[in-house]
Interface confidence: low
């Protein structure tokens, strides 16, 4: 224990460093198992041979990559957030769906609709949701633009959620917006289609209110052969939630120290 | 010490608790002196008798009170932020000044101008500034409104700084916006008049773009007898900065451990 | 800051973040985590000297007091400051799962 | 959370924030700080038990592991988590000064 100890970590203390490393490794063994609520490592008997499925790797990469607008893990975390979160993704409703019909000629915004039954399949109960991010892949762009995100609120009204200043970029770039509260709200309502609007920031006296940002999977396809990639990269919700069985365990074992 | 301390760590540990308290008190003695860069407490020989001046108390209260939109002290802090910051305030240029003339009939915004020479008097060098907040006292209001803050950028252009959703309130409420970067920019330029615009959030298809929020010291005075209080509460910049002499000391003694 | 940039490139004896890479197979004997194969966990180590004595050279005292005792604790301790999450892929039966584990990677330390 | 709401109303023996009001005059013998007269500094104290043993009753183990060792340190330590600033008024000669001191009030603790 190095608390309140003016001694240097001199060569005579090298053994201590190794001891501390071993203690930390053992702590991590416990930490990972406890976060997954596992009493011991899971059996590998039924694991299919071969590499991981493409979709699983894509999901893992989405989770691993820090994207524009996403902050690092907030510390401290509430007690429930100690446990591991299962990560899933829900793609936006396909652009060919009739719901997009009446939004086609609006130049200041693009629209993204989601089927709440798809979300409920991933997160059966609202309290299980710990984070929801809307992820959009912005194509390369030479202009700077101030954009805003809105949530569909009622038939013809939209609720402001946030804004971002997008600077020019030479490469496609993922944007992330925290929409946890919105998705939790959707889960509390019945099934149906819900949506977001991604708009130019319209100032009180501005003339040019056109959205100059192109979003993968929404803006017109520019090369036919990119269809599948395009689809894989269309806007989606990245959901982090406590699995139902872990939540039930957590609920039954909760106690005050 | 008469504080309630019913939660002793058991009678056998009372001595430890007292020892830790004494160590913490001694640590704080050192911490306060070191943050103020004082080798010993300052002499009180020249302190004028009587209570503290009203303006000093107002400034102390402004600093002490958490206001809407202001977050707690961010932790961790850069090394320079360890040291105490002197707090001053700069009131906006009086509403009778001719500079406000051309903004009078604009219904979507109110304007606040500041004299950078007043700011420079409080903060002689840009790097000394550690935080600047624009504080506005919003009068009671029964409507909800989404508002935005802009910085005067060039003759006729404004740069977006941030937004806030203001909910109805029964009592006057202070709003705070972090404008550190803006004020540091002003300090890097020559003297002159600089300003902010506080606007209604104008959506791309909205009809009513009127600002319904009334700001103390800007909106028409409703009671003649409140003149002075009104003035005391007109928009101001709350500045936190390292005093010049402390900064020079800090600069000369900086070293890598 | 006592972060990986500073600590990994110096021979700091006091509180700092120390390098530690954990290979799930080698260090923990685990084959069940499919991705990643390991990760840079790191850890905090080093004394937090309590130097507050007006007879010591003044500027040095202040710098140490500042860097090692920002919270003026009674017994300062070298602990993590910035932590980051770790996503993993593993199987439950035949079903692959992607899960995110919070606060697994130590990026910087502090005396607190 | 191991914050003032929980810790001040419980008899928690493990890591928790403890009450400490510092009266500048009584505790430090200082008359030079004009406002405030003192403040709730508080401090962190209490052991961070390292309970990770698979033969202990499982749910209890997890709850303790979670609450006391969120960062899985090698030697967990009870330290401040949330800190708040303190503004003070004092005189330099005849001139009153308002200054803000960062990280002076401990609002919550954690095992780290």
């Amino acid at each position: 224990d190095y608390k309140d100890d003016d001694d240097k970590l001199s060569t005579s203390k090298t053994i201590d460093m190794e001891l501390v490393k071993r203690k930390r490794i053992e702590a991590i063994r416990g930490q990972i198992l406890s976060k997954l609520r596992l009493a011991s490592p899971p059996s590998q008997g039924e694991v299919p041979p071969g590499p991981l499925p493409e979709a699983v790797l894509a999901l893992y990469n989405s989770t691993r990559d820090r994207v524009a607008g996403e902050s690092a893990d907030p510390e401290p975390e509430p007690e429930a957030d100690y446990y591991a979160k299962e990560v899933t993704r829900v793609l936006m409703v396909d652009r060919n769906n009739a719901i997009y019909e009446k939004t086609k000629d609006i130049s200041h915004s693009i629209y993204m609709f989601f089927n709440t039954s798809d979300i409920r399949e991933a997160v059966p109960e609202p309290p299980l949701l710990s984070r929801a991010e809307l992820r959009l892949q912005r194509l390369k762009s030479s202009v700077e633009q101030h954009v805003e995100l809105y949530q569909k609120y009622s038939n013809n009204s939209w609720r402001y959620l946030g804004n971002r200043l997008l600077t020019p970029t030479d490469t496609p770039e993922w944007l992330s917006f925290d929409v946890t509260g919105v998705v939790r709200q959707w889960l509390n309502q019945g099934d149906g289609i819900q949506g977001f609007r991604f708009s130019a920031h319209c100032s009180c006296d501005s003339k040019d209110n056109k959205l100059h940002v192109e979003i993968n999977g929404i803006s017109p396809k520019r090369r036919g052969d990119l269809g599948t990639i395009h689809d894989m990269n269309r806007p989606f919700l990245l959901l982090m939630a406590t699995p139902l069985e872990r939540a039930q365990h957590l609920h039954s074992s909760r106690h005050r120290r | 010490d008469y504080k309630d301390d019913d939660d002793k760590l058991s009678t056998s540990k009372t001595i430890d608790m007292e020892l830790v308290k004494r160590k913490r008190i001694e640590a704080i003695r050192g911490q306060i002196l070191s943050k103020l860069r004082l080798a010993s407490p300052p002499s009180q020989g020249e302190v004028p008798p009587g209570p503290l001046p009203e303006a000093v108390l107002a400034l102390y209260n402004s600093t002490r009170d958490r206001v809407a939109g202001e977050s707690a002290d961010p932790e961790p802090e850069p090394e320079a932020d360890y040291y105490a910051k002197e707090v001053t305030r700069v009131l906006m240029v009086d509403r009778n000044n001719a500079i406000y003339e051309k903004t009078k009939d604009i219904s979507h915004s109110i304007y606040m101008f500041f004299n950078t020479s007043d700011i420079r008097e409080a903060v002689p060098e840009p790097p000394l500034l550690s935080r600047a907040e624009l504080r506005l006292q919003r009068l009671k209001s029964s409507v909800e409104q989404h508002v935005e803050l802009y910085q005067k950028y060039s003759n006729n252009s404004w740069r977006y700084l941030g937004n806030r959703l203001l909910t109805p309130t029964d009592t006057p409420e202070w709003l705070s916006f972090d404008v550190t970067g803006v004020v540091r920019q002003w300090l890097n330029q020559g003297d002159g008049i600089q300003g902010f615009r506080f606007s209604a959030h104008c959506s791309c298809d909205s009809k009513d773009n009127k600002l319904h929020v009334e700001i103390n010291g800007i909106s028409p005075k409703r009671r003649g007898d409140l003149g002075t209080i009104h003035d005391m509460n007109r928009p101001f910049l709350l500045l936190m900065a390292t005093p010049l002499e402390r900064a020079q000391h800090l600069h000369s003694s900086r070293h890598r451990r | 800051a006592l972060d990986t940039n500073y600590c990994f490139s110096s021979t700091e004896k006091n509180c700092c973040v120390r390098q530690l890479y954990i290979d799930f197979r080698k260090d923990l004997g685990w084959k069940w985590i499919h991705e990643p194969k390991g990760y840079h966990a790191n850890f905090c180590l080093g004394p937090c000297p309590y130097i507050w004595s007006l007879d010591t050279q003044y500027s040095k005292v202040l710098a140490l007091y500042n860097q090692h005792n920002p919270g003026a604790s009674a017994s300062p301790c070298c602990v993590p400051q910035a932590l980051e999450p770790l996503p993993i892929v593993y199987y439950v039966g035949r079903k692959p799962k992607v899960e995110q584990l919070s606060n697994m990677i130590v990026r910087s330390c502090k005396c607190s | 959370a191991l914050d003032t709401n929980y810790c001040f109303s419980s008899t928690e023996k493990n890591c928790c924030v403890r009450q400490l009001y510092i009266d500048f005059r009584k505790d430090l013998g200082w008359k030079w700080i004009h406002e405030p007269k003192g403040y709730h500094a508080n401090f962190c104290l209490g052991p961070c038990p390292y309970i990770w043993s698979l033969d202990t009753q499982y749910s209890k183990v997890l709850a303790l592991y979670n609450q006391h060792n969120p960062g899985a340190s090698a030697s967990p330590c009870c330290v401040p988590q949330a800190l708040e600033p303190l503004p003070i008024v004092y005189y330099v000669g005849r001139k009153p000064k308002v200054e803000q001191l960062s990280n002076m009030i401990v609002r919550s603790c954690k095992c780290s």
Epitope: - | Y2, D4, N61 | - | D3, T4, S9, Y21, D23, P36
Partner: antibody
């Protein structure tokens, strides 16, 4: 507008316990310090104690053994738990909001409730 | 604990009179003193804090003075609505919050 409404008073036998509540509205309860004060019939005011926003409490020396002050910020409610009641505890009990200007003005009673009468009698 | 002693305990006066009530602390409390007015069946009402600062909405005929151990509440011209009981209160710290025993101002 600001309102404080005390409840829970009534007739109670000596030696028994009672919990008084004070429901607050019209202000941001969680960021205000709160006090309990009592007034025996025909007598002066007696300060019982105070609770800071964080839950820290201060109590008058005479109240330390038997009286406990707490608050539930989520319910905007202040509480006074009184144990081992005696005849001399008969009084009107007031809750009052602390003034929050500077220094230690938390103990200036800026706004008072109407009070609730507690009668300790066998 | 700090003891607060008010005098007189009661006084009779007429409308238009100048009335003075004093309050003495058993040790110095700087200017940490407040004055309250209480009418029968009502809770007390804050009049003055910080020894001399008039609370918002309180008529200017009320004034306070003093520091250290001796304090005074003055009503420059007594009005019919001022007949009530007045209390002083010290608040220099959590261990020294205390009320005086009160001064009843009655109609002569």
């Amino acid at each position: 507008q600001v309102q404080l409404v005390e409840s829970g008073g009534g007739v109670v036998q000596p030696g028994r316990s009672l919990r008084l509540s004070c429901a607050a509205s019209g202000f941001h309860f969680s960021s205000e310090a709160m006090n309990w004060i009592r007034q025996p019939p025909g007598k002066g005011l007696e300060w019982i104690g105070y609770i800071y926003t964080s839950g820290t409490t201060y109590r008058a020396n005479w109240a330390r053994g038997r009286f406990t002050i707490s608050r539930d910020n989520s319910k905007n409610t202040l509480y006074l738990q009184m144990n081992s009641l005696r005849a001399e505890d008969t009084a009107v009990y007031y809750c009052a909001r602390g003034w929050h200007i500077f220094g230690h003005h938390y103990w200036v009673m800026h706004f008072w409730g109407q009070g609730t009468l507690v009668t300790v009698s066998s | 604990d700090i003891q607060m002693t008010q005098s007189p305990s009661s006084l009779s006066a007429s409308v238009g009179d100048r009335v003075t009530i004093t309050c003495q602390a058993s040790q110095s409390i700087s200017t940490y003193l407040a004055w309250y007015q209480q009418k029968p069946g009502q809770p007390p009402k804050l009049l003055i804090y910080a020894a001399s600062t008039l609370e918002w909405g309180v008529p200017s005929r009320f004034s306070g003075s003093g520091s250290g151990t001796d304090f005074t509440l003055t009503i420059s011209s007594l009005q019919p609505e001022d007949f009530a009981t007045y209390y002083c209160q010290s608040y220099s710290d959590g261990d020294s919050v205390g009320f005086g025993q009160g001064t009843k101002v009655e109609i002569k």
